[in-house]
């Protein structure tokens, strides 16, 4: 099993990690859904965006998110490995000028309007932990992942190896 200390050892210095270049290595639009195939949707309410996790009606269009992928370099002394490693970080933007942010104090995931360069709270380390699912780990808070709680996105602390493949932090990306 994936020892959480392994993740934290590798990502302890995420806050100081250097993202290679300012431009993403690739970008594309995809819909985001949970392991249980609920859709992540975004609604404008009172001039701010709310994020929901819900079952869509048949033929209802899925919201798309622009995923921007960045390479991050990590020195070997942080990873515990013998050589420098690379990680893939992602930012998620469901609409122009708005990005998903990790609010570590409130343990919440929020949409904030901001300009580039984006703050560290907008970057997430991308993991393939389970089959064709991905997980998003906070750059600013190693061991904390975007997850689903009470039909909303929240930040979930993963404190043991058994929880790293838990369904509520697994997401599917689809371009259709």
């Amino acid at each position: 099993a994936f020892g959480i200390s392994g993740v934290q050892k590798y990502t302890r210095a995420l806050h100081d990690s250097s993202i290679t270049g300012i431009s993403p290595i690739t970008e594309y639009l995809a819909s985001l859904s949970t392991y249980n195939d609920q859709s992540i949707t975004f609604a404008l309410e009172d001039e701010s965006y709310e994020i929901y996790v819900e079952d869509l009606k048949k033929d209802e269009k899925k919201d798309k998110v622009l995923l921007s992928y960045y390479e991050s370099q990590h020195p070997s002394n942080e990873s515990g490995d013998g050589v420098d490693g690379k990680m893939l970080m992602v930012t998620l933007s469901p609409t122009k000028d708005f990005w998903l942010h990790a609010n570590n104090k409130e343990h919440s995931v929020e949409l904030h309007k901001c300009e580039k360069p984006l703050p560290d709270q907008a970057f997430f380390v991308l993991h393939n932990m389970h089959s064709n699912c991905v997980s998003f780990e906070c750059k600013t808070d190693p061991g904390v992942f975007i997850g689903v709680k009470d039909n909303h996105l929240a930040l979930i602390k993963v404190d043991s190896s058994e929880n790293l493949c838990t369904e509520n932090i697994l997401f599917k990306l689809s371009e259709t």
Epitope: A1, T26, Y69, K86, V125, H127, C165
Partner: antibody
């Protein structure tokens, strides 16, 4: 530096189980996924499966019922077991490491030298 | 499973030629495609990842392009050491399938 080394018997009898070990150094199996790929004589590369940093495995659909990939993080070893082998399983078997920490999107820049396994009685 | 179709299956070219190999995915794979070079008796070598990114230590005469379902590997000026078999691999969804390979031979 990153190294991967495959080991195991070079000859396996039909209907038996092929067992190979990939011993790695220069990185931790808790940080990177490891893939198994084979090259049958006169054919192209065939992806067999992956064991991810988190410990879950995914397999080639055609081999799923016969294939098991597991690992021992503390020994830095990944094992492949392929049951009920036939002559069609004769190939050079490679293990390879993911480019990116805890994700497979970047392909595999690090490979073992490969080991030839012949299935014959 | 996602099928990867490479073309041509083989080609003959001369040193200095511009060589293009294409790879077609049976469904969208975004840009999660890798290209490998393999020589007889040797392990595969990663050339390109994420469709367009040059792997460490790979000469700049190699380049990759494409996204979605159509991808191309280009060798701008073929060198003697480039005669080998080239494979594409999709890493979008498991099982991570390879193309059938393109053998580049000396004309």
């Amino acid at each position: 530096q990153v190294q991967l080394q495959e080991s195991g018997p070079g000859l396996v009898k039909p209907s038996e189980t092929l067992s190979l070990t990939c011993t790695v150094s220069g990185f931790s199996l808790t940080n990177y996924g490891v893939h198994w790929v084979r090259l049958p004589p006169g054919k192209g590369l065939e992806w067999l499966g992956v064991i991810r940093a988190g410990g879950s495995s995914d397999y080639n659909s055609a081999l799923m019922s016969r294939l098991t990939i597991s690992k021992d993080n503390s020994k830095s070893q990944v094992s492949l077991k392929l049951s009920s082998v036939t002559a069609a399983d004769t190939a050079v078997y490679y293990c390879a490491r993911d480019h990116y920490f805890s994700n497979s999107y970047g392909g595999s820049p690090y490979w073992g030298q490969g080991t030839l396994v012949t299935v014959s009685s | 499973d996602i099928q990867m179709t490479q073309s041509p299956s083989s080609l003959s070219a001369s040193v200095g030629d511009r060589v293009t190999i294409t790879c077609l995915a049976s469904q969208t794979i975004a840009t999660w495609l890798a290209w490998y070079q393999q020589k007889p008796g040797k392990s595969p070598k990663l050339l390109i990842y994420a469709a367009t990114r040059l792997a460490d230590g790979v000469p700049s005469r190699f380049s990759g392009s494409g996204s979605g379902t159509d991808f191309t590997l280009t060798i701008s000026s073929l060198q003697p050491e480039d005669f080998a078999t080239y494979y594409c691999q999709q890493l979008y969804n498991t099982p991570y399938t390879f193309g059938q390979g393109t053998k580049v031979e000396i004309k």
